[in-house]
């Protein structure tokens, strides 16, 4: 009743290993690390056979097949490169995930290297079986912004890609009789979120109630240069419109809002987010230079009343930008307190512009980002949003533009976007 001698499979072993096997002896076939027992096209960890009464084995010895991790999962905004020849996906093969640079960067500077494990899953030393995350890079235009020479009133044409975060927000309120249409600017914060001023997205009511426009009435254009040619731009509808809950129409305090886009936009040379600042109650330091872009009025001789009566005829076709210094808070407060009317400059605002006038933001630039270059991170950071100005025409002497101090709202912004700050560390000014 002796059974024939057994040969262990290639890359495998049999236990117990004996010189002879008799009736009722059992043998367990297993494979080396990185291999699986294959019997009748079924993979298993071990396989047991028995020596039968008639001196035959209950089954043939199975084979050992190398573990295959199969094609790795797709990475959103990322690429996969195979380190092993012939793009092998078997045990100990290596792949490397990378993000679509320069528009996306891997979270936490992960190596992106994954190895096919003995269990048949792609494993990373830090993330385990989880895929890495490609986050949008912020504040790094593909085209270098110009050197801040002194001297969008008094502005100049922006080259395409110079302000890749710039969004044109068009609101067409069809619930109004007659239909109401206006526009403003915004800044891309991520592939799905636009930062803007609350007054841009407040329904233009006949009273001072703060009610947001319906999301159906909002269209956002990104990668736009010339408003006459929207063919190259990405346009998106809004999934959500979020005004700051404390926005005050009487003094424009808390003039900040967000638009969540219906679909994430693909990033590229003309569409890239701007960075958010650190939570910083002081805001940008006096005399720091910043840039603002917009399609607002670029003619310094046009009065506000003419702008309002002529609709959109006085707007710029090509994106304009201007360079402005931050004005000391006390100086700005004083300049507005000397005017008749409710012109309070709160701690949630800062001013920018020149005493002598000539350069300013204007109607239609509302909601646009006032960006400052951060030397530490070498990125452009949104420190302000175009909010309001004095009663005189834009660019008047000693009439500074007033901006929402974004650094006071960083927590609110992250909260609305539903992202814990730790996850979005690369998005924050360092």
């Amino acid at each position: 009743n002796e059974c024939p001698e057994l040969q262990p499979p290639v890359h495998g072993k049999i236990e117990p290993s004996q010189a002879k096997y008799f009736f009722k002896d059992q043998v367990l076939v297993s494979c080396d690390t990185g291999y699986k027992v294959l019997k009748d096209n079924v993979e298993m960890d071990t396989f047991q056979i028995e020596c039968l009464k008639d001196g035959t084995w209950s089954n043939k010895i199975p084979t050992c097949k190398i573990v295959d991790c199969r094609a790795p999962g797709e990475l959103e905004h990322g690429l996969i490169t195979f380190s092993t020849r012939n793009n092998l996906t078997t045990y100990k093969s290596e792949i490397k995930y990378s993000c679509q640079e320069p528009y996306y960067k891997m979270l936490n500077n992960n190596t992106g290297i994954y190895t096919c494990s003995a269990q048949g899953v792609w494993m990373n030393k830090v993330l385990g079986r989880s895929l890495p995350t490609c986050l949008p890079e912020c504040g790094q235009p593909s085209r270098s912004l110009p050197s801040l020479v002194k001297r969008i009133i008094g502005g100049r044409n922006a080259e395409p890609g110079l302000f890749p975060w710039q969004a044109l927000i068009v609101v067409e309120d069809t619930s109004r009789v007659p239909n109401d249409k206006w526009f403003g600017s915004g800044a891309l914060l991520s592939a799905s979120w636009i930062l803007t001023a609350a007054h841009v997205l407040r329904s233009q009511r006949r009273d001072t109630t703060v009610i947001p426009v319906s999301k159906e009435h909002v269209t956002v254009y990104l990668g736009l240069h010339d408003v006459r040619d929207k063919s190259g731009a990405v346009n998106s509808s809004a999934a959500r419109v979020v005004l700051h809950p404390d926005f005050n129409i009487q003094n424009y305090n808390h003039d900040i809002a967000l638009v969540q886009l219906q679909e994430p936009v693909p990033l590229g040379p003309h569409v890239m987010p701007v960075c958010l600042p650190r939570l910083e109650p002081e805001g940008p330091a006096p005399h720091m230079l910043g840039l603002v872009a917009g399609w607002g009025i670029s003619n310094p001789n046009v009065t506000v009343d003419e702008i309002i009566s002529s609709g959109t005829r006085t707007l710029s076709d090509v994106l304009q930008y201007v360079k402005l210094p931050v004005v000391p808070h006390a100086e700005c407060k004083t300049s507005y307190e000397s005017r008749s009317g409710n012109y309070s400059v709160t701690e949630n605002m800062f001013c920018a512009g020149y005493y002598e006038g000539g350069k300013d933001t204007c109607l239609g630039d509302s909601g646009g980002a006032f960006v400052i270059f951060d030397d530490l991170s070498q990125r452009w950071v949104v420190q302000g949003l175009v909010s309001w100005g004095g009663p005189e025409e834009c660019g008047s002497k000693q009439v500074y533009g007033v901006y929402t101090k974004v650094s006071n709202y960083v927590d609110w912004v992250w909260e609305q976007m539903g992202l814990p700050q730790s996850v979005v560390e690369p998005q924050v000014e360092r």
Partner: antibody, heavy 114, light 112 residues
């Protein structure tokens, strides 16, 4: 077309309550607020308050804070105004309006009499 | 609270003549940010709800005849009917919407 249809006239005794309804049609009910205004016989217009159906926000004229309660039922596109502790001086025509007073209900006469 | 005062209380004007109603507010209705005056004018005929004529002090509501015009800024406002028609006989109210809402006491316009 836009319409605001109010409930019919009511006669109530002093101390009682009354609930007036205003059913909206022809526009998206949640996109605009509903205002309530009253007009006593031979008198002028007085604003009572407003409600925003999208988030149930309300604002009241101080004079009516303890008198009127505004609610909405978005499933039936209907706004309600409940008046409590009625007195003879609450006898008036009560109007609802929407789309910033572009459209008005026909008015509901509430008479308070013992 | 903002108080609205209309003058005169009543006005008799011949057909085809100009009718002018004034409205004064206890504080400015001009919002320095939006650059709008939050004042509206309404017309009310007997047994009917009010009808909006003018908003933002001077913007005519859709469908309102151009003989109706509004002017003024800050605290002083005027409604003008350039050529009174028989169908214009009504009570006219101003209303502020700068801070909640307050109506004026009304001005009755009749034909002389």
């Amino acid at each position: 077309q836009v319409q605001l249809v109010q409930s019919g006239a009511e006669v109530k005794k002093p101390g009682a309550s009354v609930k007036v309804s205003c059913k909206a049609s022809g526009y998206t009910f949640t996109t605009d607020d509903i205002n309530w205004v009253r007009q006593a016989p031979g008198q002028g217009l007085e604003w009572i308050g407003w409600i925003y159906p999208r988030d149930d926000r309300t604002k009241y004229n101080d004079k009516f804070k303890d008198k009127a309660t505004l609610t909405v039922d978005t499933s039936s596109n209907t706004a309600y105004m409940e008046l409590s502790s009625l007195r003879s001086e609450d006898t008036a025509v009560y109007y609802c309006s929407s789309l910033e007073d572009t459209y008005w209900g026909q008015g509901t006469l509430v008479t308070v009499s013992s | 609270d903002i108080v609205m005062t209309q003058s005169p209380d009543s006005l008799a004007v011949s057909l085809g003549e100009r009718a002018t109603i004034n409205c004064k507010s206890s504080q400015s209705l001009l919002n320095s940010r939006t650059r709008k005056n939050y004042l509206a004018w309404y017309q009310q005929k007997p047994g009917q709800p009010p009808k909006l004529l003018i908003y933002w002090a001077s913007t005519r509501e859709s469908g309102v005849p151009d003989r109706f015009s509004g002017s003024g800024s800050g605290t002083d406002f005027t409604l003008t009917i350039s050529s009174l028609q028989a169908e214009d006989v009504a009570v006219y109210y101003c209303k502020q919407s700068y801070n909640l809402y307050t109506f004026g006491q009304g001005t009755k316009v009749e034909i002389k």
